[in-house]
């Protein structure tokens, strides 16, 4: 007869490890006892358990409550045991010694490998602002045994760099994703993907990119100069810009206070029925936490009685 086992048994942390030891014997042969021990190199053998055909299972105090026989159905020549709730410290070499009748004793070794699945964490980098050079967008760290694989899944152009730190029973891998911030990246997902043999599927952590920017400001509403005449109702100026964070708008008149009756509604300046009083230079001031922009326009309200054409100057300043 001969003993059958596995060279390596792999189990995930916290799961039960089946340590196989099966005697393939001839007809009529019987197993009298099976002794299990841990036999790591450089250390003496540490008894795990003894299975005896007459006296049952005896588990050594160090493994009390953790070693069991597998539930039925069981082969009569099977000396396998279950090691409950595997921990990292269980990783190592194990030996089963089988005493059979009438063939004698046999022994076999296996290695138990305990996989420690990673618990990845993603840390965003410093605030991203348009105009910066290559900047850290996020870093992702995962520690496990064996070392996990950390990659990135994104549509955004960037560069990655990884480093690994080895500990006594595990390894930590950190991957960084760098990019040159641009407004087109706003709202784009950046996903850290962690692969590991102890995971049923890859773990993914997604970070949404936020890039601070402020676009140039411009004013709309003066495209048709002939509409700006005395008595016209519903005249308005609208300030155009965009930014992240969303900007706030403020209207002023360069050559004095805003005329009475003029309503400020965020990015829009609304006029009552036009009079010559409304002629002047109006300034839209756009700002967010990142920057500020100005755009000014000259309004010249025409008197329809006069033939002289309306002139409008557009000036934009940052």
């Amino acid at each position: 007869g001969e003993l059958e086992t596995s060279d390596v048994v792999t189990v995930v942390l916290g799961q039960d490890a089946k340590l196989p030891c099966f005697y393939r014997g001839d007809s009529g042969e019987q197993v009298g006892q099976v002794a299990w021990a841990r036999v790591d190199a450089g250390e003496g053998a540490q008894e795990l358990a003894l299975l005896h055909s007459k006296y049952g299972l005896h588990v050594s105090p160090a493994y009390e409550g953790r070693v069991e026989q597998p539930p039925p159905p069981r082969n009569p020549l099977d000396g396998s045991v279950l090691l409950r709730n595997a921990v990292q410290a269980d990783e190592g070499e194990y030996e089963c010694r089988v005493s059979t009748f009438p063939a004698g004793s046999f022994q076999a070794r296996l290695r138990l490998r305990v996989l420690v699945p990673p618990l990845p964490s993603l840390n965003p980098g410093p605030a991203l602002e348009e105009g910066q050079g290559l900047t850290l967008a996020a870093s992702c760290t995962a520690e496990g045994s064996p070392a996990p694989s950390v990659t990135w899944d994104t549509e955004v152009k960037g560069t990655t760099s990884s480093r690994s730190f080895k500990h006594s029973r595990s390894a930590a891998v950190t991957s960084e994703f760098h990019l040159v911030p641009s407004r087109s990246m706003n709202g784009q997902p950046l996903t850290c993907v962690v692969s590991h043999p102890g995971l049923l599927q890859d773990q993914r952590i997604t970070h949404i990119l936020h890039v601070s920017f402020l676009a140039e400001a411009s004013v709309r509403g003066l495209e048709d100069q002939n509409l700006w005449h005395i008595g016209r109702e519903g005249a308005m100026l609208k300030c155009l810009s965009e930014g992240q964070p969303p900007p706030s708008y403020n209207w002023t008149r360069l050559d004095g206070p805003l005329p009475s009756g003029v309503r400020v509604d965020g990015d829009t300046l609304g006029f009552p029925p036009l009079t010559t009083e409304h002629s002047g230079i109006y300034v839209c001031h756009v700002s967010n936490e990142f920057s500020s922009r100005d755009s000014q326009v000259t309004v010249d309200v025409l008197d329809p009685q006069e033939d002289s054409g309306k002139q409008v100057d557009l000036v934009s300043a940052s």
């Epitope: 019987q30 299975l51 006296y55 299972l57 005896h58 409550g65 069991e68 026989q69 539930p71």
Partner: antibody, heavy 118, light 107 residues
């Protein structure tokens, strides 16, 4: 020499709970799977369920909703509780041990007759 | 559930006869089958496990064979103490089930 002894009331009223204990002597309860099996008068054998010394159990689905098997390693005993009994539960109840290296009941108690009647 | 059907259900034989009892499983059970002997008023006694392995202390006139769905218990030379009821039992899947029994009586 390991011996098993069933104990408990021989008469149980319908709708009540049947309770039996199996005491293991001459050896340890640890390391084995322990079962309850019953045999109605003049009929065949029916497996009720097993318990491992660590406490894990497996029950016959036909009785699962009514049966509980527990173990007390300090007393070297395991027990059977069968709730809501009827006359159909009248039987000789055996406790038995599963072999350490094989699946078969190598040691049996002598059995105890439980009659369900009002 | 796996059904075990024993045949015959009743058997009449004489001392010294060779007796064969068959146990058929409704589906394959590998070799996870045991045979027991039961005498009136007594608990069953294990004879054979794993279809063909003789339990320690059981006389060698008892033997078992088969695998899959068809199994046999053979008593090579029937002795007076062998008159009893014999049961097969499967351990391949839950619930564990027994055959209905074969009663061996004196002819």
């Amino acid at each position: 020499q390991v011996q098993l002894q069933e104990s408990g009331p021989g008469l149980v009223k319908p709708s009540e709970t049947l309770s039996l204990t199996c005491t293991v002597s001459g050896g340890s309860i640890s390391g084995y799977y322990w079962s309850w099996i019953r045999q109605p008068p003049g009929k065949g054998l029916e497996w009720i369920g097993y318990i491992y010394y660590s406490g894990s159990t497996n029950y016959n689905p036909s009785l699962k909703s009514r049966v509980t098997i527990s173990v007390d390693t300090s007393k070297n005993q395991f027990s059977l509780k069968l709730s809501s009994v009827t006359a159909a539960d009248t039987a000789v109840y055996y406790c038995a041990r599963l072999g350490i290296f094989f699946d078969a009941f190598d040691i049996w108690g002598q059995g105890t007759l439980v009659t369900v009647s009002s | 559930d796996i059904q075990l059907t024993q045949s015959p259900s009743f058997l009449s034989a004489s001392v010294g006869d060779r007796v064969t009892i068959t146990c058929r499983a409704s589906q394959g059970i590998s070799s996870y089958l045991a045979w027991y002997q039961q005498k009136p008023g007594k608990a069953p006694k294990l004879l054979i496990y794993a279809a063909s392995t003789l339990q320690s202390g059981v006389p060698s006139r008892f033997s078992g064979s088969g695998s899959g769905t068809e199994f046999t218990l053979t008593i090579s030379s029937l002795q007076p103490e062998d008159f009893a009821t014999y049961y097969c039992q499967q351990f391949n899947s839950y619930p564990w089930t027994f055959g209905q029994g074969t009663k061996v009586e004196i002819k």
